[in-house]
Amino acid sequence: QVPPQYPPIQSIRVQFTRCENEKGCIITSPSKDETMKVQDNSIIINCDGFYLISLKGYFSEELSLSLYYRKGRGPLFSLSKVTSVDSIGVAYLAFKDKVYFNVTTHSTSYKDIQVNGGELILIHQNPGGFCAY
Amino acid sequence: QVPPQYPPIQSIRVQFTRCENEKGCIITSPSKDETMKVQDNSIIINCDGFYLISLKGYFSEELSLSLYYRKGRGPLFSLSKVTSVDSIGVAYLAFKDKVYFNVTTHSTSYKDIQVNGGELILIHQNPGGFCAY
Amino acid sequence: QVPPQYPPIQSIRVQFTRCENEKGCIITSPSKDETMKVQDNSIIINCDGFYLISLKGYFSEELSLSLYYRKGRGPLFSLSKVTSVDSIGVAYLAFKDKVYFNVTTHSTSYKDIQVNGGELILIHQNPGGFCAY
């Protein structure tokens, strides 16, 4: 008998090279094989459970950046007046959540911020839990 | 044939709103669906393996906080004279280990410390390894 | 019917007590049960996917330390002029990658650096993906 294989884990790596003031960061998924999807500049959560979240990037301007997952809830990450981020967190997310950026710059002279090495990774930590597609 | 499902991963999120000087933090598990249990203010480890550990909280007073897993072993986390914590770590834990807090305050004027957003998450990273219940 | 078990997750914990200037850190795996192997002072990657990486240590001298995984690619971690490290990261690694240290000291008076509590942990986060042995 063939030993059971793991079904694919829900995970995604998105990249971002640009953030817009009072909007967010423009995210793209470089791989077509991701088990999670990007829609309307947000990462769609289909499975309940803990997620390991990694956020990295160097910014061309000083900015304040937050990563949200649900309207009316506090951010997953919140960084004030930074030029870089290299953070890891764990959060419980659920079906219908959407992970997205909010960015504010503190200068009136530019709208877009260049991002070097901008990367957001989400990895589901509770396979076997509830999922809806 | 139905594809194999993942058995539930050992994981738990506990919350704490209060820490006691020279004791620990009073932990409660908000969900009844957790795959790990709290006993005598400690999280019980049933499965050997690496664990992802996330610890967060804002304290009403300056304190020194350690998170232990086994008598005679060094702490998983140790923070000296802090008013907040937001840390992630990886550690190898084993059956019979118990994860618990130790707290010391640096003032004689109070015993209890209020905690805002106090959260401890443990997620097993080696399903398939040895477990005993 | 017996519920399916998880195949072992690819993971390893290596220890290092010594680093050599302009070379790396001498890594040893304390356990024979590891699912990943050390070869030529590097950790061999057999499975594609995200890895959770934990790096800790206290150094006897100030050093600059990088952790690499592939020639011509940037480092997984890069620390400049430090006496300790306690970092966690997430990275996508693939079959044929090798995880290894590069170390530079900023003194001509010694070659070897003693390391206290030197530990590197890798844990695969995408079981079910491609592996080659």
Epitope: N116 | - | R73, S80
Partner: antibody, heavy 122, light 107 residues
């Protein structure tokens, strides 16, 4: 508005020394790494030196290593390039430019000053 | 160290497409950045990460990168686009590496 203004360029004899300055305004200077890039007359661009935001880490192109020193005074919002043992082939327009930390896996220059001319000739 | 090869000069007819190339060993595995330098002025970043445009750079500028060649395209060249164009990559040992530049003349 971000501004980088170089000064200190001059005519100097081979073997001589010169110190270039770059005054920054319109941003938090202490938060950003900086570099010097040069351009010989009629030639292309060449990176010269880099310094991180705090001033604790520097890098140099092989051709200037041991002769040039990059430094910064964050209190004065000023970047410096001390050039010693100057040679004829150091003749160029020297630009200061804002960049990312060298620990990043990629890098480019996204703000440039207008440059200052250094001429090394006997 | 890593070498980037550019043609010294290129002519383009007004409002026609201009393609400026930058060659390098397996350059497609690196990110390429492009600068425009007009006569007597400082360089200006016009493309980063192969194809991203900074704020204020016209949409007629675009970039691509694969194999051994990166390409800067000006979809309809204007007189004001007459300038020198430099490609640049980041090399962990040599740091910032520039091509020798291409002088674009708009006819």
């Amino acid at each position: 508005e971000v501004q980088l203004v170089e000064s200190g360029g001059d005519l100097v004899k081979p073997g001589g020394s010169l110190r270039l300055s770059c005054v920054a305004s319109g941003f938090t200077f202490s938060s950003f790494p900086m570099s010097w890039v040069r351009q010989a007359p009629g030639k292309g661009l060449q990176w010269v030196a880099y310094i991180n935001s705090g001033g604790s880490s520097t890098s140099y192109a092989d051709v200037v290593k041991g002769r040039f020193t990059i430094s910064r005074d964050n209190a004065k919002n000023t970047l410096y390039l001390q050039m010693n043992s100057l040679r004829a082939d150091d003749t160029a327009v020297y630009y200061c430019a804002r960049t990312f930390p060298t620990v990043a896996t990629d890098n480019w220059f996204y703000y440039w000053g207008q440059g200052t001319l250094v001429t090394v000739s006997s | 160290s890593y070498v980037l090869t550019q043609l010294p000069s290129k002519n383009v007819t007004l409002k026609q497409a201009a393609h400026i190339t930058c060659g390098g060993d397996n350059i497609g595995s690196k990110s390429v950045h492009w600068y425009q330098q007009k006569l007597g002025q400082a360089p200006v970043l016009i493309i980063y990460y192969d194809s991203s445009r900074p704020t204020g750079i016209p949409e007629r500028f675009s970039g691509a990168n694969s194999g051994n060649t990166a390409t800067l395209t000006i979809s309809g060249a204007l007189a004001e686009d007459e300038a020198d164009y430099y490609c640049q990559v980041w090399d962990s040992s040599a740091k910032w590496v520039f091509g020798e530049g291409t002088q674009l003349t708009v006819l």
